[in-house]
């Protein structure tokens, strides 16, 4: 029904009130629900009304505003505190400790997250986001120097459906349209062979603990398993012979690796040659990832500070040691 | 199959010295944090020492610090207990455990070794 | 360093019967906590980690609970190979502790 310049939705009453003409619902279970569109963010819950915008949100704290969009600092909260000289007996000795991995502990010094002190130093979001890796959407983290919210805004639930056989069958130059979805890591590629590579700038240079024989024999499963985690592929990259740049890495020089060494009667430079893991040059290419989702990475940067988001996390399946973001050409170093 | 055997344990001295052995097998021993862990006779378990092998990160029981030594050869995959200063409280079976978390020393031991035995008795 | 309390330190139980072993921590350890089983002559065996998750090879009889400072392990129906002694331990802050144990006998 209409009334003048007022068009009312399906279900509405016209209204005359004193103020002009109104749409009104006498009954909400025969109008087109506010709520239809999830208008409530972060978290709030949404409740039908009667007249527009035809909803109400109840927010939870630490926001409000029509659609719960408003941040509000908690008055007084106490910034976080770290178990001072425990922690700091206990950072940065290559070994993450739980009471230590917060982000006013450093995460440890580093020990819990790849060596990257803070892996949310470029978010700028009122909140903080490290804090809000829960399983549900924040949009005020849902941008990429604030890693996209851990990927909670786009059905982080989804699962590959044949995860056994996508995984057997991943980046093995056969299309296999079942795989060919972000979940199940758009099948390494394979079926977008005839695609020209979007490569996003800059090189992961990661630390894996698997000597490097190792790695390349494992290497479909390793680059889908951080491909799962960023979203997108990952590959190998060659240097200019053309040879994939996986190098044998002897280990930090840490201060008590060192000491470990002089409480062992070892020979002068025994153990300085030997084998610790893999020195590893990744690439992205992005070719499918920006056909299907707006979250790419279009540098290496904030892909590396995922990575040890999920180190902080735990949920890294492969001993990964450090990662960092190369933006020029890498020069073979150990 | 992952797999832990201690040796070197045995009767000792009040006052002496022994080194304890943790051979690994069936994973990449640098890869997990270490544990000694012992059980006096008729008692419960105590926590010993640890390390990480990739970075020789240590941490003690107060029990034992200043006393014990773990170490680790990656080249070998056995971590070792150096026990001095040996007292009667010492007298233990002493397993060696593995952590179940890469670099976390906050993870559970999830694969333990059959225990050696050390008796500190005059 | 943290304390870890066990409940009962032993119990008489027959088979089939559920079993409640409780586990309190003398400060917060969050869900960094683990249960182990131990056989006479033999060495501790990882039942539960983070407080609730079963490791391999746990048959699903075994169950644990609880986070911060009260913790329990749970055996729905006491099976023979189950009579042993149990114990808790945080990892949580080192040094890591374990409770006393609570020794599960038959009746």
């Known amino acids: 029904s209409s009334c003048g310049q007022v068009k009312c939705r399906k279900g509405e009453q016209c209204v005359h009130t004193a103020s002009g003409p109104r749409c009104f619902c006498p009954s909400p279970r025969d109008c087109e629900s506010g709520c239809a569109s999830s208008p409530c963010q972060h978290g709030g819950s949404c409740h039908p009304q009667r007249q527009p915008p035809y909803y109400s949100c109840q927010c939870a704290p630490p926001f409000s505003g029509s659609r719960c969009e408003l941040y509000t600092a908690p008055p007084s909260t106490p910034p976080a505190t770290c178990l001072s000289q425990y922690c700091a007996d206990k950072a940065r000795d290559g070994v993450c400790d739980e009471a230590c991995n917060s982000h006013a502990c450093q995460w440890d010094g580093g020990d819990c997250s790849l060596t990257m002190e803070n892996p949310w130093a470029n978010c700028s979001s009122p909140l903080p986001c490290w804090d809000y890796i829960n399983n549900q959407c924040d949009e005020l983290c849902n941008t990429v120097e604030c890693l996209f919210d851990n990927f909670e805004c786009q059905g982080n639930s989804k699962t590959c459906k044949y995860d056994k056989y996508c995984a057997d069958h991943f980046k093995d130059n056969h299309c296999d349209q079942g795989c060919n979805s972000e979940e199940c890591g758009w099948d390494g590629l394979d079926c977008a062979a005839d695609q020209p590579e979007n490569l996003a700038e800059g090189t992961l240079v990661i630390v894996v603990l698997m000597p490097p024989e190792q790695l390349l024999q494992d290497a479909r499963s390793f680059l889908r398993a951080l491909g799962t985690l960023l979203h997108t592929n990952l590959r190998i990259k060659r240097d200019s012979q053309g040879e994939l740049m996986v190098y044998p890495y002897y280990g930090e020089k840490s201060a008590a690796m060192k000491k470990q060494r002089m409480t062992r009667r070892s020979l002068p430079g025994e153990q300085e040659q030997e084998v610790a893991g893999s020195k590893v040059f990744l690439e992205i290419d992005n070719r499918q990832c920006v056909q299907d989702s707006d979250h790419c990475f279009k540098n290496t940067d904030a892909a590396a500070a995922l990575l040890a988001s999920h180190a902080i996390q735990g949920t890294l399946s492969y001993p990964l040691v450090s990662v960092v973001s190369e933006s020029l050409t890498p020069e073979r170093t150990q | 199959e992952v797999q832990l055997v201690e040796s070197g344990g045995g009767l000792v001295q009040p006052g002496g010295s022994l080194r304890l052995s943790c051979a690994a097998s069936g994973y990449t021993f640098s890869s997990y944090g270490m544990s000694w862990v012992r059980q006096a006779p008729g008692k419960g378990l105590e926590w010993v020492s640890y390390?990480?092998?990739?970075?020789?990160?240590?941490y003690y029981a107060d029990s034992v610090k200043g006393r014990f030594t773990i170490s680790a050869d990656t080249s070998k995959n056995t971590a070792y207990l150096q026990m001095n200063s040996l007292r009667a409280e010492d007298t233990a079976v002493y397993y060696c455990?593995?952590?179940?978390?890469?670099?976390?020393?906050?993870?559970?031991?999830?694969?333990w070794g059959q225990g050696t035995l050390v008796t500190v008795s005059a | 360093d943290i304390q870890m309390t066990q409940s009962p330190s032993s119990l008489s139980a027959s088979v089939g019967d559920r079993v409640t072993i409780t586990c309190r921590a003398s400060q917060s350890v969050r869900s960094f906590l683990a249960w182990y089983q131990q056989k006479p002559g033999k060495a501790p065996k990882l039942l539960i980690y983070r407080a609730s998750i079963r490791a391999s090879g746990v048959p699903s009889r075994f169950s644990g609970s609880g986070s911060g400072t009260d913790f329990t392990l749970t055996i729905s129906s006491l099976q023979p190979e189950d009579f042993a002694t149990y114990y808790c331990?945080?990892?949580?802050?080192?040094?890591?502790?374990f409770g006393q144990g609570t020794k599960v006998e038959i009746k």
């Open positions: 390390i990480y092998p990739y970075s020789g990160a240590t």
């Open positions: 331990q945080q990892y949580y802050i080192s040094p890591w502790t």
């Open positions: 455990a593995r952590h179940s978390g890469y670099y976390r020393i906050s993870s559970a031991m999830d694969v």
